[in-house]
């Protein structure tokens, strides 16, 4: 396949990535699947600059990102290293809070209304952001 040179319609370009901002909500797994079907992934935040960009577009609304600890350690969906990477948790988060009646632990990360991150029950129907890299080879065959 050929490399993408511009973002799909209704996606926003920023720093060689394309972003799509939902206007409805889905559980984390459904949001993750939606992005994959678009040949993308839930947003992976790698810098303060990218954090500010995403925050500007989502506003003060709880929004899923591509970070979870459903299998133990925190992991970014694209394989970006969590331990050495950018983090922007709210104070005392993540707490993987189990002491509630909300169906197990809090295994999925989201942007809160002030942009900082919190871990929450993955079933909540939050909005979400998909991201895909412009340099990634597209699935479309090259034009002859």
């Amino acid at each position: 396949g050929s490399e993408r040179t511009c973002c799909p319609v209704n996606w926003v370009e920023h720093e060689r990535s394309c972003y799509w901002f939902s206007r409805s909500g889905k559980a984390w797994a459904d949001a993750d699947n939606y992005c994959r079907l678009e040949d993308a992934h839930l947003v992976v935040v790698t810098s303060w600059e990218e954090q500010k960009f995403v925050q500007h577009h989502i506003g003060p609304v709880n929004t899923w990102m591509g970070l979870h600890d459903q299998n133990g350690p925190w992991k970014w969906v694209d394989g970006t290293d969590y331990e050495t990477g950018f983090k922007n948790w709210r104070p005392e988060q993540p707490d993987d809070w189990y002491g509630h009646g909300l169906g197990g632990g809090e295994d999925c990360a989201h942007f809160t209304d002030d942009g900082r991150w919190n871990d929450d029950v993955c079933q909540r129907p939050y909005r979400w952001v998909c991201e895909t890299e412009l340099d990634k080879a597209s699935q479309e065959p090259p034009l002859l």
């Epitope: 809070w97 002491g99 509630h100 009646g101 809160t112 919190n118 079933q123 129907p125």
Partner: antibody, heavy 126, light 107 residues
Framework: QVQLVQSGAEVKKPGASVKVSCKAS????????INWVRQATGQGLEWMGW????????GYAQKFQGRVTMTWNTSKSTAYMELSSLRSEDTAVYYC???????????????????WGQGTTVTVSS | DIQMTQSPSSLSASVGDRVTITCRAS??????LGWYQQKPGKAPKRLIC???SLQSGVPSRFSGSGSGTEFTLTISSLQPEDFATYFC?????????FGPGTKVDIK
């Protein structure tokens, strides 16, 4: 037993604000959501939003965005809903309801509002 | 927002009757739907979650079915204490939305 007890009836003038309280007992307050739902006389139920005292998260229905604020005092196990710029259409009974995700074996999670307050009547009249 | 509609808006029935109430969603909500019962002057009470799962303590004459956009609440044999208003609630997306309600009264 688990219960939510709400503050008493209020009469307010248009343009004013009202703050309704909801005191939880019989369970760990920070372990569940609190939802706020209202019902005008003879009308249906209208979901206003939710808050979670553990995470600090809140979510408001767009219709009330900018006019509603949901807060809580953990030490008092009490949730509050404040509605500002009141108009006559805000005359209603306001309910708080405990919410959580219930697990059905093999079927995922489903949200339930299992315990409700007795309701607080708010009348807006000049 | 997801719109919920209910039919009928009211119905008259006798004790022992089989009663069916329908709730429709404006888009696919899978089975993210609950049914609530409300009596005059009282707070709502949960009956069914996940479209078909009976809450503990709720009599077995109540049942729910459906998924996607169409859902049904059935009372197999109406009892005197069942005369009330019934609401559906979707929790598939924020804002959660209730149906307008179905009032069941005595014929």
């Amino acid at each position: 037993q688990v219960q939510l007890v709400q503050s008493g009836a209020e009469v307010k003038k248009p343009g004013a604000s009202v703050k309704v309280s909801c005191k939880a007992s019989g369970y760990t307050f920070t372990s569940y959501d609190i939802n706020w739902v209202r019902q005008a006389t003879g009308q249906g139920l209208e979901w206003m939003g939710w808050m979670n005292p553990n995470s600090g998260n809140t979510g408001y229905a767009q219709k009330f965005q900018g006019r509603v604020t949901m807060t809580w005092n953990t030490s008092k196990s009490t949730a509050y809903m404040e509605l500002s710029s009141l108009r006559s259409e805000d005359t209603a009974v306001y309910y708080c309801a405990r919410g959580f995700y219930d697990t059905l074996t093999g079927s995922g999670y489903y949200y339930v509002m299992d315990v409700w307050g007795q309701g607080t009547t708010v009348t807006v009249s000049s | 927002d997801i719109q919920m509609t209910q039919s009928p808006s009211s119905l008259s029935a006798s004790v022992g009757d089989r009663v069916t109430i329908t709730c429709r969603a404006s888009q696919d909500i899978r089975n993210d739907l609950g049914w609530y019962q409300q009596k005059p002057g009282k707070a709502p009470k949960r009956l069914i979650c996940a479209a078909s799962s009976l809450q503990s303590g709720v009599p077995s004459r109540f049942s729910g079915s459906g998924s996607g956009t169409e859902f049904t609440l059935t009372i197999s044999s109406l009892q005197p204490e069942d005369f009330a208003t019934y609401f559906c609630l979707q929790h598939n997306d924020y804002p959660f939305t209730f149906g307008p309600g179905t009032k069941v009264d005595i014929k």
